[in-house]
């Protein structure tokens, strides 16, 4: 059965940021600011119709 | 550096995997100036069944 939704897994490096333990804790300012910037960025990139949103953001050391 | 992993959702049939990657890659320069994020090593793949329940007839 089709859900009517396509999902894509996307991964990328941010080379001018340093990973630290606060990116493992969603309650920290660093985590929340980066998540907000990334979410806003994706809304800009895929602003044409069809984009439903993003989920499961994870940060890892590069 | 920081590796970011996430899942994007689109209405079915509105974008292919190539355009997901291309549109993101074309935005990298603006991401650097607007968000001060230097992005590299972009990788995109479709999330396989059963997560997206994609394989049935539409």
């Amino acid at each position: 059965l089709s859900t009517g939704v396509s999902f894509f897994f996307l991964s990328f490096h941010i080379s001018n940021l340093q990973f630290n333990s606060s990116l493992e804790d969603p309650s920290t300012d660093y985590y929340q600011e980066l998540q907000r910037d990334i979410s806003e960025m994706f809304l800009q990139i895929y602003k044409q119709g069809g984009f439903l949103g993003l989920s499961n953001i994870k940060f890892r050391p590069g | 550096s920081v590796v970011v992993q996430l899942t994007l959702a689109f209405r079915e049939g509105t974008i292919n995997v190539h355009d997901v990657e291309t549109q993101f890659n074309q935005y990298k320069t603006e991401a650097a100036s607007r968000y001060n994020l230097t992005i590299s090593d972009v990788s995109v793949s479709d999330v396989p069944f059963p997560f997206s329940a994609q394989s049935g007839a539409g």
Epitope: G49 | N16, P48, Q54
Partner: antibody, heavy 120, light 107 residues
Framework: QVQLVQSGAEVKKPGASVKVSCKAS????????MHWIKQAPGQGLEWIGY????????HYNQKFKDKVTLTADKSASTAYMELYSLRSEDTAVYYC?????????????WGQGTLVTVSS | DIQMTQSPSSLSASVGDRVTITCRAS??????LVWYQQKPGKSPKLLVY???TLTDGVPSRFSGSGSGTQYSLTISSLQPEDVATYYC?????????FGSGTKLEIK
């Protein structure tokens, strides 16, 4: 109405280059991606690559990346495909084809084709 | 790269016959599958996109179906003007590969 009109047939010697044009009319040239397709005599269709005339972004089939350059002239609403270092296996009909607009994953209009013959 | 395997390579059928051409992708192409018709000496013409959507002006005897890796084009009642070569195309990911074609003839 939408039209893609390609330049005429060419005969070239091995090692030479050729530039094929595709003049678009009847729509806004910069808002549709233009693709190029090869069809060798009696053979099937082979995708070469595309150009987005609005941004000049190009993407090539790896097989053709050292063989072809795609360009576009916005002011003339014309797309170009230049083939380099021609060999006999480059003899083919080359088509330009417009990709439909947003979320349109198909070629809705095709040029009439340009026959490029490579012969010594 | 996604390979598109089209079958049969040629087909001879009678006027009024039901004809089916199949196309198998080497990976899931999520219905980003297009069918074109090419008559001798002419440019290809769009028939079906998104695996099953008929383009404007194409007779309703043509239909597309399938999902995942398996797709087909059916002509419910073959007409003389349907003599042509039919190609499928992957539009899921680059390179946007074509099938090798099916040459359809009238018996």
């Amino acid at each position: 109405q939408v039209q893609l009109v390609q330049s005429g047939a060419e005969v070239k010697k091995p090692g030479a280059s050729v530039k094929v044009s595709c003049k678009a009319s009847g729509y806004t040239f910069t808002t549709y991606t233009m693709h190029w397709i090869k069809q060798a005599p009696g053979q099937g269709l082979e995708w070469i690559g595309y150009i987005n005339p609005g941004s000049d972004y190009t993407h090539y089939n790896q097989k053709f990346k050292d063989k072809v350059t795609l360009t576009a002239d916005k002011s003339a609403s014309t797309a170009y495909m230049e083939l380099y270092s021609l060999r006999s296996e480059d003899t083919a009909v080359y088509y330009c084809a417009r990709q439909g607009n947003y979320a349109a994953y198909y070629f809705d209009y095709w040029g009439q084709g340009t026959l490029v013959t490579v012969s010594s | 790269d996604i390979q598109m395997t089209q079958s049969p390579s040629s087909l001879s059928a009678s006027v009024g016959d039901r004809v089916t051409i199949t196309c198998r992708a080497s990976g899931n192409i999520h219905n980003f599958l297009v069918w074109y018709q090419q008559k001798p000496g002419k440019s290809p013409k769009l028939l079906v996109y998104n695996a099953k959507t008929l383009t404007d002006g194409v007779p309703s005897r043509f239909s597309g179906s399938g999902s995942g890796t398996q797709y087909s084009l059916t002509i419910s009642s073959l007409q003389p003007e349907d003599v042509a070569t039919y190609y499928c195309q992957n539009f899921w990911n680059v390179p946007f590969t074509f099938g090798s074609g099916t040459k359809l003839e009238i018996k």
